[in-house]
Interface confidence: medium
């Protein structure tokens, strides 16, 4: 199990980072060497190491082994991106669970389970002992935390502070309790990485001791990372190759999670009379082959024996002796009731797709000419031929007459969201389509993300509204009130326009919200002279899944010395990182003392790649999004509220550069908050406010 | 969804019940309340959204407050009376805001009797 | 107040027949109507949302039609375990009503299967 070749498995490895220390006592030991794994073999036996090997970097472009006493978790140390470095991180100091009786434990726990704090190990109050860290080398007894040096049955354990009790064991968790999947793990994206029986997973990006084709490049959205358990191929659940010579593969102990139903995103589109896509979301109700022969009862083992039984593929709708996709096939099928025939595709279920031509587009589909006329809202779209007026004032070069045919959708403008139409209906003039980016398709719809390419502000300087500087006041900033009450932020972008979050709109009645404009006390107290409020007027929803919403008020804002707009970025641009910026809000605090005065925290751009780190790898950002941390170690990035902007200032012009929303793990201590990127959709906000009435003033 | 805290308890007596979430985020859905007296209908008392603000049925205004932490969501019933014995539902709303109800919990008891 | 009613309470019909529920709104909900089916002790089971989308995993014998203010709930090819009380859910309000004018549930239809 543990050849001296196979170390490396004991480490997280983190792509294109390294760790630089801010602590200049921190000692760090390096050698020229040829690969990683010998920089696994050396940490993990801290052969010839002056220190405990905790974490290693390897850079590839020196052929360098850099070794650590400290991780990406210790403080005085900071992650830095490099294309030339990967960081490796002993799991056993990261990991915040036990395998087995957690002889292995090397995290910081130091409570017991009855909750009194840990004795140091190298102290003798209130208790003497022999477990002397000089007396355990490779235990990692260090400060007071909970150890098991001898591997005892209860799991890792102290001697207490509380002199009336010697010992008790520290209440870890077993990382088979933590761990949990829904379905069959098909989106299981945790951190198990052994077998049920205990056997170590080999790493998919190594082929020893087994070859095979799951290569993490090859298939980047299976979630390859280092020797996790996944199940990329729709077994009953995840598994992985094994460091056993003799085991090519195994299961792993993971254990279904109390709620089993998958996230509305996972599901499939579920129809019932017909495929869409390769039919696993097909939900209805055919249950004989292409030719007649009925399908036999999928929780039966006759005619034939399988192991696709309702209990394995939980999510999978195996009812009765109904046409199904389980595992991925081309579409559904079922083992039939003929012994002589095991398996029989039901291809006779009509596709959903025959009426609409294309189901799906590539890029930003420019080139989509399937027959979809419909909005996503369900308005029927009107003739191409009817609207060349309105297109022509939002685009400045001749459209291509031979695809704009009938009504059908299409992407006359290079629309970076897709494929859209023109309505009948004055209020919605044009909508995007239901239709989506073809599955696999990966061509960005805004290249050069990471490369400051495009400069965020307009190349004018900065405006003056009253003789005073905009970037002095906060007059941009809007209340939206829901039956009386403060909700959320937004941005003024426009005197009819208001940018905030989807979330803010629980009612579909636009009389239950007013917005604040001009304020500086939530409650408007003191702010009677400046105060402006106005009704709203409709809702425009941004693209699909940018939790947008550009808010219509009912009557223009007067800009004054209280009430300003603010600008837009350019579209697809990108600020540098470190840039200073500020998240404004109200703060939805719920505290009795709260003062109710606008409140700002001050933080930082940071990278994609970098602010995927901070979080543990657990989120993938995108080009919709953008990344923001706080200067202040512990501040959390959204002290705002929903709907509010983020602000940051380039060539003295101060932009909204992000909109706060839902579920993107603000306020949390050393996370940098994730936004919506405005400048991702720039041209939707020009197009909408180019295209939709407002009333004048 | 899981709803626990529901016990027998005399009238007068606060009572919280928790609805515990997992496989998916509050920051995603909003969670509604529903009670069911013993041989009744159903009856909706309220509703927490995906930003924290909270609508109540018009006769459970005043009578139930909602609040959520980032995986669960509770109901107080302040001063119980006798016609509040039912059992109590937490239900995920589809989306954000006002939907159908697409997964319930198995309820929990609360009986208020002296 | 948006008021929902149900009729009938209770029907009675035999394996392999037809029920028919209908649900009457006091004012136009548009399609914001959604069915549940109860069965005794256990909790409410989404059947149809958007008056008549069948939700996942459920049968094609269950059917949703109407808008506006008439809805009906159709169940052909009645089975034993389609015993059970069947609600309707209005989740459309107007704020020219009172607030609890929302997620309001039908009075229930009991469907006894012989």
């Known amino acids: 199990q543990r050849k001296r070749r196979n170390t490396i498995h004991e480490f997280k490895k983190s792509a294109k980072t390294t760790l630089i220390k801010i602590d200049p006592a921190l000692k760090i030991k390096t050698k020229k060497v040829n690969t990683a794994d010998q920089c696994a073999n050396r940490c993990t036996r801290n052969k010839g190491l002056p220190f405990t090997c905790k974490a290693f970097v390897f850079d590839k472009a020196r052929k360098q082994c850099l070794w650590f006493p400290f991780n990406s978790m210790s403080s005085g140390v900071k992650k830095e991106f490099g294309h030339e470095f990967d960081l490796y991180e002993n799991k056993d100091y990261i990991r915040n669970c036990i395998i087995g009786k957690g002889r292995s434990y090397k995290g910081t726990v130091s409570i017991t389970k009855s909750g009194i704090k840990c004795q140091p190990w190298s102290s003798m109050i209130p208790h003497e002992h022999s477990f002397l860290p000089s007396s355990y080398r490779g235990k990692d007894l260090q400060e007071n935390y909970c150890r098991n040096p001898r591997g005892e049955e209860g799991g890792p354990w102290c001697f207490t502070s509380n002199p009336e009790v010697r010992y008790e064991v520290c209440d870890i968790p077993q990382c088979s309790e933590v761990e949990c999947m829904t379905c069959n793990g098909e989106s299981y994206r945790g951190l198990m990485d052994h077998t049920e029986s205990g056997k170590i997973c080999q790493r998919w990006d190594h082929q020893t001791p087994h070859r095979h084709k799951f290569l993490p490049e090859r298939y980047p959205d299976k979630g390859f990372d280092d020797n996790y358990c996944r199940n990329p191929d729709g077994q009953p659940r995840p598994w992985c190759y094994t460091l056993d010579p003799h085991t090519r593969w195994e299961y792993c102990a993971i254990k279904t999670c109390a709620d089993n139903t998958m996230n509305d995103t996972d599901v499939p589109l579920e129809t019932t009379e017909c495929i869409q896509g390769q039919g696993e979301g097909y939900r209805g109700t055919v249950n004989t082959i292409w030719n007649g022969i009925p399908c036999q009862r999928w929780d039966s083992q006759y005619p034939h024996e399988h192991d696709m039984t309702p209990e394995n593929f939980k999510c999978k709708d195996l009812r009765e002796n109904y046409c199904r996709n389980p595992d991925g096939s081309e579409s559904p099928w079922c083992f039939t009731t003929d012994p002589n025939i095991r398996v029989g595709y039901c291809s006779q279920i009509p596709n959903c797709d025959m009426s609409h031509g294309q189901d799906c587009y590539r890029g930003n589909g420019k080139n989509y000419m399937g027959n979809l006329s419909q909005t996503r809202s369900g308005l029927t779209c009107s003739m191409w031929d009817k609207n060349m007026e309105d297109l022509h004032r939002h685009i400045f070069w001749e459209p291509d007459a031979s695809k704009l045919n009938e009504n059908y959708c299409r992407n006359p403008d290079d629309d970076a969201h897709g494929p859209w139409c023109y309505t009948g209906n004055p209020l919605i003039p044009w909508d995007y389509c239901p239709i989506s980016r073809c599955e696999g398709d990966t061509t960005p719809t805004i290249v050069n993300l990471d490369h400051p390419v495009i400069s965020c502000a307009k190349t004018k300087q900065l405006r003056v509204v009253n003789g005073i500087p905009t970037r002095t006041n906060i007059g941009w900033m809007v209340s939206l009130r829901y039956r009386n009450k403060h909700i959320c932020g937004g941005s003024l972008i426009k005197e009819s326009w208001v940018l905030t979050a989807r979330q803010c709109f629980p009612s579909r009645d636009l009389k239950d919200y007013e917005a604040w404009l001009g304020i500086h006390d939530v409650h408007g107290r003191g702010d009677e002279k400046c105060k402006q409020v106005l009704n709203v007027s409709q809702l425009v929803y941004g693209p699909e899944g940018s939790d947008l919403v550009l808010m219509k008020l009912a009557r223009p804002a007067v800009l004054d010395d209280f009430v300003s707009t603010i600008d837009l970025p350019n579209y697809g641009c990108t600020i540098p990182e470190k840039t200073s910026c500020s998240v404004y809000g109200w703060g939805y605090t719920g505290l009795i003392n709260y003062d109710g005065l606008l409140r700002v925290a001050h933080l930082y751009i940071m990278g994609n790649e970098k602010c995927s780190q901070h979080h543990r790898g657990k989120v993938t950002l995108n080009e919709s999004e953008i990344c923001a941390g706080a200067e202040k170690i512990g501040s959390g990035p959204c002290e705002g509220d929903y709907g509010g902007p983020l602000v940051c200032e380039q060539h003295k012009m101060r932009m909204v550069l992000g909109v706060i929303v839902p579920g993107r793990g603000c306020a949390i201590p050393n996370r940098p908050g994730i936004f919506v990127r405005v400048a991702y959709y720039a041209k939707w906000i020009h197009k909408i406010i180019l295209t939709y009435k407002v009333p004048q003033s | 969804v899981e709803e626990s805290g529901g016990r027998l308890v005399m009238p007068g007596t606060p009572l919280t019940l928790t609805c515990t979430v997992s496989g998916f985020s509050l920051s995603s859905n909003a969670i509604s309340w529903v009670r069911q007296a013993p041989e009744k209908g159903l009856e909706w008392i309220g509703v927490?959204?995906?930003?924290?603000v909270t609508d109540y049925a018009s006769w459970a205004q005043g009578r139930f407050t909602i609040s959520k932490t980032s995986t669960t969501v509770d109901l107080k019933i302040p001063s119980p009376t006798t016609e509040d014995t039912a059992t109590y539902f937490c239900?995920?709303?589809?989306?954000?805001?006002?939907?159908?109800?697409?997964?319930w919990g198995p309820g929990t008891l609360v009986t208020v009797s002296s | 107040d948006i008021v929902m009613t149900q009729t009938p309470s209770s029907v009675e019909a035999a394996v392999g027949g037809t029920v028919t529920i209908k649900c009457q709104a006091s004012?136009?909900?548009?399609?914001?109507l959604a069915w549940y089916q109860q069965k005794p002790g256990q909790r409410p089971k989404l059947l149809i949302y958007?008056?008549?989308t069948l939700a996942s995993g459920v049968p094609s014998r269950f059917k949703g039609s109407g808008s506006g203010t008439q809805f009906t709930l159709t169940i052909s090819d009645l089975e034993c375990a389609d015993a059970a009380t069947y609600y309707c859910?209005?989740?459309?309000?107007?704020?020219?009503?009172?607030?609890?004018?929302?997620?309001?549930f039908g009075g229930g239809t009991e469907v006894v299967v012989k």
């Open positions: 927490i959204y995906v930003i924290g």
């Open positions: 239900a995920r709303v589809y989306d954000s805001g006002w939907n159908h109800f697409n997964l």
């Open positions: 958007s008056a008549s």
């Open positions: 004012e136009n909900i548009y399609r914001l």
């Open positions: 859910q209005n989740y459309y309000y107007s704020s020219r009503s009172s607030y609890d004018t929302y997620n309001v």
